[in-house]
Interface confidence: low
């Protein structure tokens, strides 16, 4: 349905708190360095039009596109040219393409200081002196940081944001009440950016078929009682949400995912019984809370696949008709028998089944030839079930920190022309999954620990395009979606990497490593670490081990010292030196 | 919303030439990487090439390897695919679509016959 005006339609769906919003946000991710001051200006400035637009839709202007008002807007900020370079050529562009060329420019690993948590005494006088101020800069912040970040779902965050200053600013301990719960926030926010940016990695790179694969299965295993019809529709609605969060048009998309939480509460009945309690929360905690509701339970009387994918013979009639929907239809039965199934693996599977159906089909007896493909599903199964198990034994041995260590050689050997803070950050968040997995009972670990890893991978992919360096990487990132892990999982030590020359700069230690947090000083050492294996890729666990062991016990001798930097200084060489004969 | 319009079919010699393009339109086309498919008669649906969003990085499937060429304007929002030597066996309706190997054509197509 069109509108006379598109901002003025958006303005009264939405309202005017979370227009304010989105836009802040949408411009936040488009003009990642702009100062913050800046993009209030421009916001207010667009508000007030909106305003001028809903009194009267026919007003000067108001029947414009959205990109084209925030365009000509963002293209109105003074020292674009000198902030962004050869983005400022976008605004010699035309609608669409100006729109495009802004999305071609967001930055995934923007050159912005990492954001320092003042005092809280600070933060609480901050939010009392200008509470409205002091959301916006949460906003601001989080989207520049995150330009892919789920725009409605960054409000439900910041709403979060405030409600734990306004609870805990008041409470006898501020800092016991309100740190936790930042830090809670900071956790879910840094899943809910890389979650999304898979997503948008998924629509963008792989088409949205890939994407309705995804959600086909995911949306099935959530809803096993709904019916295909049903789980369809919630598909079509979920990948237009997401194609314009992805595009950068905020306001489309946050209309519409309140469009299909409305939808979905509507319809509970045919949907899951699990969405009741959602439906009774206001709109940006209900569309959460049915973002993440649990899986409904299976119905009891499923029948076996068998018959229809396997046994029947109108399998390739069936699947010429309607190739999409027959492989959707498949895809939805055996995801809503699955919930113990990563999303990837069912993935594989319809990848399997579908290869199957296009050989046997062209045989002279199809039936015959396809009458074994649910065995050929075995190993698929198996080796993500492996994976899990050894891991998790693995993690359950060393603890969180050493199992990072271990991932961190593991990685680094396979591709050691990534950038060290690359595989630092990546090794350590994929070390992550085990406690955030391996604690869970067996029907929930493989689901758990293969998708979440996805995530973790995409973000290697994503970095690592902006910075290609490793035909490996560009390989596994760009050759199948739901390959992605498999194809890390089985490269081996890179046999043609010539290792990196000893440089002691890099192994020089100072006393302000004393003062840092055990997060930050583990990522020093981390660091250390991948570099050592870049300079030999071929040392054994054991040497490696020895040389981690000497370095923590360098630091925490010279760290107890009373002249500190003096014992670094003169125990850091002997280290160096021992490090390079142990690892000769 | 999204558009794809496919044109440059048409009647063809075998060893011709064409060269197909696709106009896009309610979409990031710079952000997103983008194939050509094609159906023969009473066929289905065959991946034919893919590029990348920035038109870097281009694959074929094999039965036109050599033969043909897959490329994009991102200032026109335009996908184009020249297609030389051509054989009866690519007679077919051409379609583009949003996406690499994979991915789903959703505008008219463009027929493209190759008969003496």
């Known amino acids: 349905d069109t509108h006379k005006s598109e901002v003025a339609h958006r303005f009264k769906d939405l309202g005017e708190e979370h227009f304010k919003g989105l836009v802040l946000v949408a411009f936040s991710q488009y003009l990642q360095q702009c100062p913050f001051e800046e993009h209030v200006k421009l916001v207010n400035e667009v508000t007030e039009f909106a305003k001028t637009c809903v009194a009267d839709e026919s007003a000067e202007n108001c029947d414009k596109s959205l990109h084209t008002l925030f365009g000509d807007k963002l293209c109105t900020v003074a020292t674009l040219r000198e902030t962004y370079g050869e983005m400022a050529d976008c605004c010699a562009k035309q609608e669409p393409e100006r729109n495009e060329c802004f999305l071609q420019h967001k930055d995934d690993n923007p050159n912005l200081p990492p954001l320092v948590r003042p005092e809280v005494d600070v933060m609480c006088t901050a939010f009392h002196d200008n509470e409205a101020t002091f959301l916006k800069k949460y906003l601001y912040e989080v989207a520049r940081r995150h330009p892919y970040f789920y725009a409605p779902e960054l409000l439900f965050f910041a709403a979060r944001y405030k409600a734990a200053f306004a609870e805990c600013c008041q409470a006898a301990d501020k800092a016991a009440c309100l740190l936790p719960k930042l830090d809670e926030l900071r956790d879910e926010g840094k899943a809910s950016s890389a979650k999304q940016r898979l997503k948008c990695a998924s629509l963008q790179k792989f088409g949205d078929r890939a994407f309705k694969a995804w959600a086909v299965a995911r949306l099935s295993q959530k809803f096993p009682k709904a019916e295909f019809a049903e789980v369809s529709k919630l598909v079509t609605d979920l990948t237009k949400v997401h194609t314009e969060c992805c595009h950068g048009d905020l306001l489309e998309c946050a209309d519409d995912r309140a469009d299909l939480a409305k939808y979905m509460c509507e319809n509970q009945d045919s949907i899951s019984s699990k969405l009741k309690e959602c439906c009774d929360k206001p709109l940006l905690e209900k569309s959460h809370c049915l973002a993440e509701v649990e899986n409904d339970e299976m119905p009891a009387d499923l029948p076996s696949l068998a018959a229809d994918y396997v046994e029947s013979k109108d399998v390739c009639k069936n699947y010429a008709e309607a190739k999409d929907v027959f492989l959707g239809m498949f895809l939805y039965e055996y995801a809503r028998r699955h919930p113990d199934y990563s999303v990837m693996l069912l993935l594989r599977l319809a990848k399997a089944y579908e290869a199957t159906l296009e050989k046997c089909c062209a045989a002279a007896d199809p039936h015959e030839c396809y009458a074994k493909v649910f065995d050929e599903f075995q190993p698929l199964v198996e080796e993500p079930q492996n994976l899990v198990k050894q891991n998790c034994e693995l993690f359950e041995q060393l603890g969180e920190y050493k199992f990072q260590n271990a991932l961190l050689v593991r990685y680094t050997k396979k591709v050691p022309q990534v950038s060290t803070p690359t595989l630092v950050e990546v090794s350590r968040n994929l070390g992550k999954v085990g406690a955030k997995c391996c604690k869970l009972p067996e029907a929930k670990r493989m689901p758990c620990a293969e998708d979440y890893l996805s995530v973790v991978l995409n973000r290697l992919c994503v970095l690592h395009e902006k910075t290609p360096v490793s035909e490996k990487v560009t390989k596994c990132c760009t050759e199948s979606l739901v390959n992605r892990r498999p194809c890390f999982s089985a490269l081996e030590l890179d046999e043609a990497y010539v290792p990196k020359a000893f440089n002691a700069e890099t192994f020089t230690f100072h006393a302000d490593m004393c003062t840092l947090s055990e997060k930050e000083k583990q990522v020093k050492k981390q660091t250390a670490l991948v570099e050592l294996v870049k300079h030999k890729p071929k040392a054994t666990k054991e040497q490696l081990k020895g040389v981690m062991d000497n370095f923590a016990a360098f630091v925490e001798k010279c760290c107890k010292a009373d002249d500190k930097e003096a014992c670094f200084a003169e125990e850091g060489p002997k280290f160096v030196a021992a490090s390079q004969a142990a690892l000769a | 919303q999204v558009q794809l319009v496919e044109s440059g079919g048409g009647l063809v010699q075998p060893g011709g030439s064409l060269r197909l393009s696709c106009a896009a339109s309610g979409f990031a086309f710079r952000g997103f990487g983008m194939s050509w498919v094609r159906q023969a008669p009473g066929k289905g649906f065959e991946w034919v090439s893919s590029i990348n969003n920035g038109g870097s990085d281009t694959r074929y499937a094999d039965s036109v390897k050599g033969r043909f060429t897959i490329s994009r304007d991102n200032a026109r929002n335009t996908l184009y695919l020249q297609m030389n030597s051509l054989k009866p066996e690519d007679t077919a309706v051409y379609y583009c679509?949003?996406?690499?190997?994979?991915?789903?054509?959703s505008g008219q197509g463009t027929q493209v016959t190759v008969s003496s």
């Open positions: 679509a949003i996406g690499g190997p994979g991915a789903s054509p």
